[in-house]
């Protein structure tokens, strides 16, 4: 009596259980009463990531540099290529199909939250006692240098964009 269901890694065809092709291989011909399933490895830049009966392998994803993308992990016959964004950009989705430019925080502002895979940079003004002298998508506000701990005195006050300038203490003659 012909089977109605097959074991794992098999499929039913013509009232017969045939072996699926392993990941990285595609189906060339179904098994018969006398022959095994015939499978063939995927070509260069192709993959199949499951036990399958596909007659065509999938093309590896293309990480388009014009969209700010680069290859993070090159695909194999069993896995797709993984794209990520170039430095200074972030993915527009978890799948990272395209990138957008990180917002930079201007001098006087620091990064409150660095851009994540799916959200842009969040900036905050540097409070009193802190400064940022660069336009950056990474740098937080830095605390002013403590002149006292270096046995120096403040010669020039700091701002939200500049550090304090320390100098030697006046010596009594």
């Amino acid at each position: 009596e012909p089977p109605t269901a097959c074991r794992e890694k098999q499929y039913l065809i013509n009232s017969q259980c045939c072996s699926l092709c392993q990941p990285g291989q595609k189906l060339v011909s179904d098994c018969t009463e006398f022959t095994e399933t015939e499978c063939l490895p995927c070509g260069e830049s192709e993959f199949l990531d499951t036990w399958n009966r596909e007659t065509h392998c999938h093309q590896h994803k293309y990480c388009d540099p014009n969209l700010g993308l680069r290859v993070q992990q090159k695909g194999t016959s069993e896995t797709d290529t993984i794209c990520t964004c170039e430095e200074g950009w972030h993915c527009t989705s978890e799948a990272c199909e395209s990138c957008v430019l990180h917002r930079s925080c201007s001098p006087g502002f620091g990064v409150k939250q660095i851009a994540t895979g799916v959200s842009d940079t969040i900036c905050e003004p540097c409070p009193v006692g802190f400064f940022s002298n660069v336009s950056s998508a990474f740098e937080k506000c830095h605390p002013w240098t403590s002149c006292e701990t270096k046995d120096l005195v403040v010669q020039q006050a700091g701002t939200n964009k500049t550090d304090v300038v320390c100098g030697p203490q006046d010596r009594l003659r």
């Epitope: 990941p23 993070q72 992990q73 090159k74 896995t79 430095e87």
Partner: antibody, heavy 116, light 112 residues
């Protein structure tokens, strides 16, 4: 661009180790971060990796007692390892993982000693 | 488990000579491979990524080659400064795979 691990130190057997790695000069949302350790006189031993979507992969020996997390606000990656034994004595490194098109960045490492 | 097997464990060669280090992955890692150099008391230093791309500042005496499961690091015109331990590292991660150690066991290069 730099990566730096928090201070290690002396731990007792059964203690839990928590190490924090702080990155600066790059957005780690585009990179994978790894933890690696090296016992005295031994080779490099990979512990695990976290990717930009917070997916984690662990070495089979580390899976049951290691957790790697990221905090994008603080720009940090944390390794938590439970049930320490003397065999966990090593220098622990955090690194921005090398990938197919970009080089990695290693931290200087921090020494963790487990002894009763 | 994906296992990285590195050979030889140690190799010795004269200044000006050539050494070849091999790394075998237990499955196809698709050129997602790096080579690192480590000297005592220092963190590793990246030499090569993507199986054959030279990292910034690394001299062209270092050459990476190979594909799929077999990879090679060749150091030519050996210098005394090349004395170090060299490690291969798989940068290939897949939900369907597990990993014992993504690093090879290391090769100590002695320069005579």
């Amino acid at each position: 661009q730099s990566v730096k691990e928090s201070e290690g130190g002396l731990f007792k057997p059964t203690d839990t180790l928590t190490l924090t790695c702080t990155v600066s000069g790059f957005s780690f949302s585009n990179y994978r971060m790894i933890w690696v350790r090296q016992a005295p006189g031994n080779g490099l031993e990979w512990i695990g990796v976290i990717d930009r979507n917070d997916n984690t992969y662990y070495a089979t020996w580390a899976k049951s007692r290691s957790t790697i997390t990221r905090n994008t606000n603080l720009n940090t990656v944390t390794l938590k390892m439970t049930s320490l034994t003397a065999a966990d004595t090593a220098t622990y490194f955090c690194a921005r993982d090398t990938d197919y098109t970009t080089g990695g960045i290693w931290g200087p490492g921090t020494l963790v000693t487990v002894s009763s | 488990d994906i296992v990285m097997t590195q050979t030889p464990a140690s190799v010795s060669a004269a200044v000006g000579g050539t050494v070849t280090i091999k790394c075998q992955a237990s499955q196809n890692i698709g050129d997602n491979l790096a080579w690192h150099q480590q000297k005592p008391g220092q963190p590793p230093k990246l030499l090569i990524y993507g199986a054959s791309t030279l990292a910034s500042g690394v001299p062209s005496r270092f050459k990476g080659s190979g594909s799929r499961t077999e990879y090679t690091l060749t150091i030519s015109d050996l210098e005394c400064a090349d004395a170090a331990t060299y490690y291969c590292q798989s940068n290939y991660y897949s939900t369907s795979s597990s990993y014992y150690n993504s690093f090879g066991g290391g090769t100590e290069v002695v320069v005579k």
